[in-house]
């Protein structure tokens, strides 16, 4: 009679993480008698996957029933397979023997490997905000999946980016793997509404990439430009000076008026206008009673933007020699010049 | 669903032979391995041995050869453990347990006193 | 014949405590046939850990399972009053198969 032998049929089977692996195996005698086991792996560090008469493996279960007479398929099936599960495994006869039983004959062995999907790709900007013209960098992280093949684009704005470093971990075999990806983008005043996207494609998503977004909003901080002008006078006495302050992001502001370098008022940005670009517009005034002064007057508009040092500009108002004598009643004649900076 | 029923409380005197059963029911008595387990009062558990159903064969562990004999009956489904010569070290709670090892029969106590 | 050591024989632990128990075995133990069982008096023994990490059907996520070779251990992240019990491990690497002589654990 023929010396039994154990038939796996296939090489290697591809599973998706989540489904079930059936693992064929078949013998060609009944004797000797014996049990059958499964393992993963060979040699002294193999696991055991299935035994057909002792221990507990709760995700296996039996293609055929075992204890019916003549049978020979010792197939299984293992349920929601994870990356954890890749490996080869082998169909093992053994003999029965005293004190263990004997391992008679092992199958070639099935290389059960497992496609998993990677995790949604996590985009992460900079700590902290940076002004147009600067290079903010960009990273991307995805988990989990297998096999080692992906492939990671950079786009912002639809348009692809070039600037960009990526790595899969571990360079090794693995049962999953991660990929980490850092790109450069350099920063233009338009940015408050871009946005950048990283996409993943892999085997497992079946040409429907994963994509991971981040706003350049949270990146960018654009400061404001200032611009103090006389306006029209309301009375003979008084002067009324405007803070233009322009196209900055984000929102948070304060605004300070000094008048020749003493604080006379403090307000926070409130009711602003917001620009096609998405950038803010606001502007604050300042009633003079040019009456109070006998000398001209340095009117000044601090900003602090953003938690950033202050930006401010200053103007002078010329209380003229006529006004200066007669007081308000010449509050008209009173001009308002432009000084550098302070 | 899967039980194991064992026999009931048996006090026996010393010398004597018992024979404890366990009745499997909701799963094939041959696809598994049978274990008897021992379990003295208030102290740990002590495996005796296995039976194969399908074919008899049958391990035991040094301590119980020659004291402990284990059979099987597929007919009845049912699994026995038979004990010799019994004296009061004899006295404890006897287990059968599945070989997949996560059911176990609610256990028979023996007693040996005279 | 592989020894089974358990310790401690007996310990105590406060509500919310970590609990670490260990298994020595005399010889090297596969970790796929290295199995724990829990016990509460007047009850069959409940299978618990099975192949040194996987946890049986019903257990808490705070019980877990680890070790290799000769040294293997069961830990509760943080001890329930209702894991007041005896812990068993267990050897089917090879013939005669072996309990550990338990770790009665109480409440405090």
């Known amino acids: 009679e023929d010396e039994l032998q154990v038939i796996q049929p296939e090489k290697s089977v591809s599973v998706a993480a989540g489904e079930s692996a059936t693992l064929r195996c078949a013998m060609t005698s009944l004797i000797p008698v014996g049990p059958i086991m499964w393992f993963r792996g060979a040699g002294a560090g193999r696991e055991l996957i299935y035994n057909q008469k002792e221990g507990h493996f709760p995700r296996v279960t039996t293609v055929s029933e075992l204890t019916k007479r003549n049978n020979l398929d010792f197939s299984i099936s293992i349920s929601n397979i994870t990356p954890a599960d890749a490996g080869t495994y082998y169909c093992v006869k053994f003999r029965k023997g005293s004190p263990d039983d004997v391992e008679f004959k092992s199958g070639a062995g099935t290389e059960l490997s497992v496609r998993a999907k990677p995790s949604a790709p996590v985009v992460s900007g900079p700590a902290v905000r940076a002004t147009p013209e600067h290079t903010v960098s960009f990273t991307c992280e995805s988990h989990g999946f297998s096999p080692r093949d992906i492939t990671l684009k950079w786009f912002k704005n639809g348009n692809e980016l070039s600037d960009f470093q990526t790595n899969v971990d571990p360079a090794g075999d693995s049962v999953s793997y991660s990929i980490h990806s850092t790109a450069r983008v350099v920063l233009t005043r338009g940015d408050v509404h871009s946005q950048v996207i990283c996409e993943i494609a892999h085997i497992t998503l079946q040409g429907d990439p994963l994509r991971g977004t981040a706003n350049l909003s949270e990146a960018i901080r654009v400061p404001p430009t200032l611009e103090v002008t006389q306006q029209p006078m309301r009375a003979e006495n008084q002067a009324n000076v405007t803070c233009q302050v322009s196209n900055f992001y984000p929102r948070g502001l304060q605004l300070t008026w000094l008048e020749n370098g003493n604080v006379s008022r403090t307000e926070t940005a409130s009711t602003l206008i917001e620009n096609k670009d998405g950038t803010y517009n606001w502007m604050s005034w300042l009633l003079v009673n040019t009456c109070a002064h006998r000398d001209d007057v340095v009117l000044t508009c601090q900003v602090e933007h953003d938690g950033q040092q202050a930006v401010s500009k200053s103007y002078a108002l010329e209380i003229s020699a006529h006004q200066k004598e007669h007081g308000s009643d010449i509050t008209h004649e009173a001009a308002l010049a432009p000084t550098a900076p302070l | 669903e899967v039980q194991l029923q064992q026999s009931g409380v048996e006090v026996v005197q010393p010398g004597a032979s018992v024979k404890l059963s366990c009745t499997a029911s909701?799963?094939?008595?041959?696809?598994?391995?049978m274990h008897w387990v021992k379990q003295r009062t208030e102290q740990g558990l002590e495996w005796i041995g296995r039976?194969?159903?399908?074919?008899?064969?049958?391990k035991y562990a040094p301590k119980f050869q020659g004291k402990a004999t284990m059979t099987a009956d597929t007919s009845s489904s049912t699994a026995y453990l038979q004990l010799s010569s019994l004296t009061s070290d004899d006295t404890a709670v006897y287990y059968c347990?599945?070989?997949?090892?996560?059911?176990w029969g609610q256990g028979t106590t023996l007693t040996v006193s005279s | 014949q592989i020894v089974l050591t358990q310790s401690p024989a007996i310990m105590s632990a406060s509500p919310g405590e970590k609990v670490t128990l260990t298994c020595s075995a005399s010889?090297?133990?596969?970790?796929?046939?290295l199995y724990w069982y829990q016990q509460k008096p007047g009850s069959s023994p409940k299978l618990w850990i099975y192949?040194?990490?996987n946890l049986a059907s019903g257990v808490p996520p705070r019980f877990s399972g680890s070790g290799s070779g000769t040294s293997y251990s069961l830990t509760i992240s943080s001890m329930q009053a209702e894991d007041a019990a005896s812990y068993f491990c267990?050897?089917?690497?090879?013939?005669?198969?072996?309990f550990g002589g338990g770790t009665k654990l109480e409440i405090k």
């Open positions: 347990v599945r070989g997949s090892y996560e059911y």
């Open positions: 909701g799963f094939n008595i041959e696809a598994y391995y």
């Open positions: 039976i194969d159903p399908e074919d008899g064969e049958s």
């Open positions: 010889s090297s133990v596969s970790s796929s046939y």
């Open positions: 192949s040194t990490s």
């Open positions: 267990y050897q089917w690497s090879s013939y005669p198969y072996t």
